[in-house]
Amino acid sequence: RPSFSLVEDTTLEPEEPPTKYQISQPEVYVAAPGESLEVRCLLKDAAVISWTKDGVHLGPNNRTVLIGEYLQIKGATPRDSGLYACTASRTVDSETWYFMVNVTDAISSGDDEDDTDGAEDFVSENSNNKRAPYWTNTEKMEKRLHAVPAANTVKFRCPAGGNPMPTMRWLKNGKEFKQEHRIGGYKVRNQHWSLIMESVVPSDKGNYTCVVENEYGSINHTYHLDVVERSPHRPILQAGLPANASTVVGGDVEFVCKVYSDAQPHIQWIKHVEKNGSKYGPDGLPYLKVLKHSGINSSNAEVLALFNVTEADAGEYICKVSNYIGQANQSAWLTVLPKQQAPGREKEITASPDYLE
């Protein structure tokens, strides 16, 4: 059921040529878990730089360092993956640059070609020295979290020794992992103490446990696999925009909506209005008016400019962005002050980075 009654028809028209949005795939920075990553904001003449991740303001913490035009992530984890943006705020305008961070293991899609040291993993013991299983190469087991793009090949390794030579079996989410549990099955390379899954899909997500045992004991190690889906996403709007603004009667004001979309976005600026003295229709839904939308006859749809405002222009302004995948919207309030009252510091007409949430 619609959440509003439209005063004007909002049928999607052919969108504006994509000169104002970063629609192509942004630059991708790849790091392995545990590594540090440093990215420089590729924008010039920045008075103030602010950063966002997946549309949410990014502040410094114990792993994130923001120094000037540089972003540093220490000890990256798969959770650091996402869409980042730096916004350079200048005296007259602002500009945003987007980039992707992908924290993932570079996993070979080959069949153990990278196991040049595989023979060393298979440790033979003096037959008299009976020994419970033990790990022979814990370095290869340090990365417990594996975030892998769909269709890639994944390899988990548990190099072990013991006497007699231990056996290895694998569990998925704590239960026996059977070949029929996934299309295409999987391979176990006992010589290399490895489990190989080719062409992973989202249903492969989960915890994988190797259990290595002999008659003297049992050890286990668990990996977590996250399959990163490659599919187009709905629009992302920069946090804090549009920003609340105020102006005096007769003044001018601008609202800005910064959009990232990997499918052509359609932008609408919408305002709550009154019809026949009422803000709500007979169905109880608010009346809304489309003030501007991206289209052939529309210039920069990311900016809504209001000139010579009156008290009637006060209220909530919604930036609504859609593509064929989904929608996103954020809003801001316009306060219209009497002529004699000047706007306060936090009510600048143009959006300031101070307002990034």
Epitope: I23, P232, R234, S322, Y324
Partner: antibody
Framework: QVQLVQSGAEVKKPGASVKVSCKAS????????IHWVRQAPGQGLEWMGA????????SYNQRFKVRATLTADTSTSTVYMELSSLRSEDTAVYYC??????WGQGTTVTVSS | DIQMTQSPSSLSASVGDRVTITCGAS??????LNWYQRKPGKAPKLLIY???NLADGVPSRFSGSGSGTDYTLTISSLQPEDFATYYC?????????FGGGTKLEIK
């Protein structure tokens, strides 16, 4: 696991209406458009329209705007496509799709007197 | 409405062949183009979105290229399971029109 499950095949007489359902699971239902696409025998794919379940926003192919109605029930994560004033040319397989990435299995609608 | 024209309408090829299918739009669609594979009795499967991006679980032998009004789907080395009908689609503006399809058959 994202899944779209459509209702079963329908046989209708000319002039009648048909209502096809598409039940979604495995994702946040309100975050994605559900599109409807049909394919008539020996023909190509034809986009009919889309609905955004979060607020009920709809967009239609002008060819179907008068006869097609898309609705969404967020309580059951189900989208419905109703096509009225059926004619023999509407005989086709009707698909729902989440943003064209995940598709339902298809519903065959046969219009015959 | 934006018209999408695919060529060829049918194509015979052998396993291991490199195959190219083209799609033309009646106006600039700025890379807003998807490619699908459809097998008889099955729903279409998204292969490429945004003209060049490989969708989930799609083998890397599939690739997409193009800009403006001209787009191409390439299969670098045909596999037995690739014999199907392929469609391009405009996702720039509604109605989201499809090309007429290219039927890829075994030679």
């Amino acid at each position: 696991q994202v899944q779209l499950v459509q209702s079963g095949a329908e046989v209708k007489k000319p002039g009648a209406s048909v209502k096809v359902s598409c039940k979604a699971s495995g994702y946040t239902f309100t975050n994605y458009y559900i599109h409807w696409v049909r394919q008539a025998p020996g023909q190509g794919l034809e986009w009919m329209g889309a609905i955004y379940p979060d607020n009920g926003d709809t967009s239609y192919n002008q060819r179907f705007k008068v006869r097609a109605t898309l609705t969404a029930d967020t309580s059951t994560s189900t989208v419905y496509m109703e096509l009225s004033s059926l004619r023999s040319e509407d005989t086709a397989v009707y698909y729902c799709a989440r943003a064209f990435t995940y598709w339902g299995q298809g519903t065959t609608v046969t219009v015959s007197s | 409405d934006i018209q999408m024209t695919q060529s060829p309408s049918s194509l015979s090829a052998s396993v291991g062949d490199r195959v190219t299918i083209t799609c033309g739009a009646s106006e600039n669609i700025y890379g807003a183009l998807n490619w699908y594979q459809r097998k008889p009795g099955k729903a279409p499967k998204l292969l490429i979105y945004g003209a060049t991006n490989l969708a989930d679980g799609v083998p890397s032998r599939f690739s997409g290229s193009g800009s403006g009004t001209d787009y191409t789907l390439t299969i670098s080395s045909l596999q037995p399971e690739d014999f199907a009908t392929y469609y391009c689609q405009n996702v720039l503006s509604t109605p989201y029109t499809f090309g007429g399809g290219t039927k890829l058959e075994i030679k």
